[in-house]
Amino acid sequence: YDFTNCDFQKIEADYLRTISKDLITYMSGTKSTDFNNTVSCSNRPHCLTEIQSLTFNPTPRCASLAKEMFARKTKATLALWCPGYSETQINATQAMKKARKSKVTTNKCLEQVSQLLGLWRRFIRTLLKKQ
């Protein structure tokens, strides 16, 4: 999906209002210095591309993020403010259904969510630079 035509201001507002709080809740008990950020993003479409991929692509080390509250809200936000996004997400929905039902938060999932927080912060910073 090409995120170029999204309403970035609306996505930022949704992130600050709800998604960020859910991410921080997920990370509760860990310090921001516990994990090194190894990925970043350069502009707003890039940030959303990587956020989407990291949130919904299961990895061998962390297969369950797609069922988390922040992931559901991320999906809803992108569907609302990115024209045509929801039509491209049939496969992602299948991936969410296949994701493990276990609610165990592994260290690797915490690390992945830490990377997500970094990508979202970079998204916000690129918005501030443009304004």
Epitope: T38, H46, E50, S53, L54, R61, Q115
Partner: antibody, heavy 117, light 108 residues
């Protein structure tokens, strides 16, 4: 400390597919970062080809996108480049590199690929 | 695509002198700029990222500055091992990261 090593044929015929592999040691490629390919024609500057992130997102240089495939084999801690329909203009030193998806902090030593019949 | 133009093409200096290398972007890249050093027969090495942050293990004599379209790499006092080709790279314009054509720093 992470080390990267490119391997593959040094000579490819025009119209064929160039295939290179990068073996990573000292770091698990499924643990973090992105894994990138960059090339440098003899005596010229650098050109970014593309990357694959540890979680599977892939990005290619638009000028090469129709001909490029980057894939990963986590069991061997390797990632690969395929460039189809090559011409003499694809003759270059090909580097693999670790990236945070923005810049490139660790590089292989490079391998020269010549396209010639 | 954003075109990165480096000047001069060649810089002839003596050890101990100050080197000032320029990189100009065809449009603003904010501070999304890196500098690399490449010696003959070797891979490039990251020196500077985010326009002014030194990469791990890079000596303090290397410094970067600038924002928007004009950037500078300064080597405060050239050591013999600093004679090499230097490239800038913009990473503002994903998915089209581009490098400058390079500046060669040679011994005078």
């Amino acid at each position: 400390q992470v080390q990267l090593q490119e391997s593959g044929p040094g000579l490819v015929k025009p119209s064929e597919t160039l295939s290179l592999t990068c073996t990573v040691s000292g770091y698990s490629i499924s643990s973090g970062y992105g894994w990138s390919w960059i090339r440098q024609p003899p005596g010229k500057g650098l050109e970014w080809i593309g990357y694959i992130s540890y979680y599977g997102s892939i990005s290619y240089n638009p000028s090469l996108k129709s001909r490029v495939t980057i894939s990963v084999d986590t069991s061997k801690n390797q990632f690969s480049l395929k460039l189809s329909s090559v011409t003499a203009a694809d003759t270059a030193v090909y580097y693999c590199a670790r990236t945070n998806l923005l810049y490139f902090d660790s590089w292989g030593q490079g391998t020269l690929v010549t396209v010639s019949s | 695509e954003i075109v990165m133009t480096q000047s001069p093409a060649t810089l002839s200096l003596s050890p101990g002198e100050r080197a000032t290398l320029s990189c100009r972007a065809s449009q603003s890249v904010s501070n999304n700029l890196a500098w690399y050093q490449q010696k003959p027969g070797q891979a490039p090495r990251l020196l500077i990222y985010d326009a002014s942050s030194r990469a791990t293990g890079i000596p303090a004599r290397f410094s970067g500055s600038g924002s928007g379209t004009d950037f500078t790499l300064t080597i405060s006092s050239l050591e013999p091992e600093d004679f090499a080709v230097y490239y800038c790279q913009q990473y503002s314009d994903w998915p089209q990261y581009t490098f400058g054509q390079g500046t060669k720093v040679e011994i005078k």
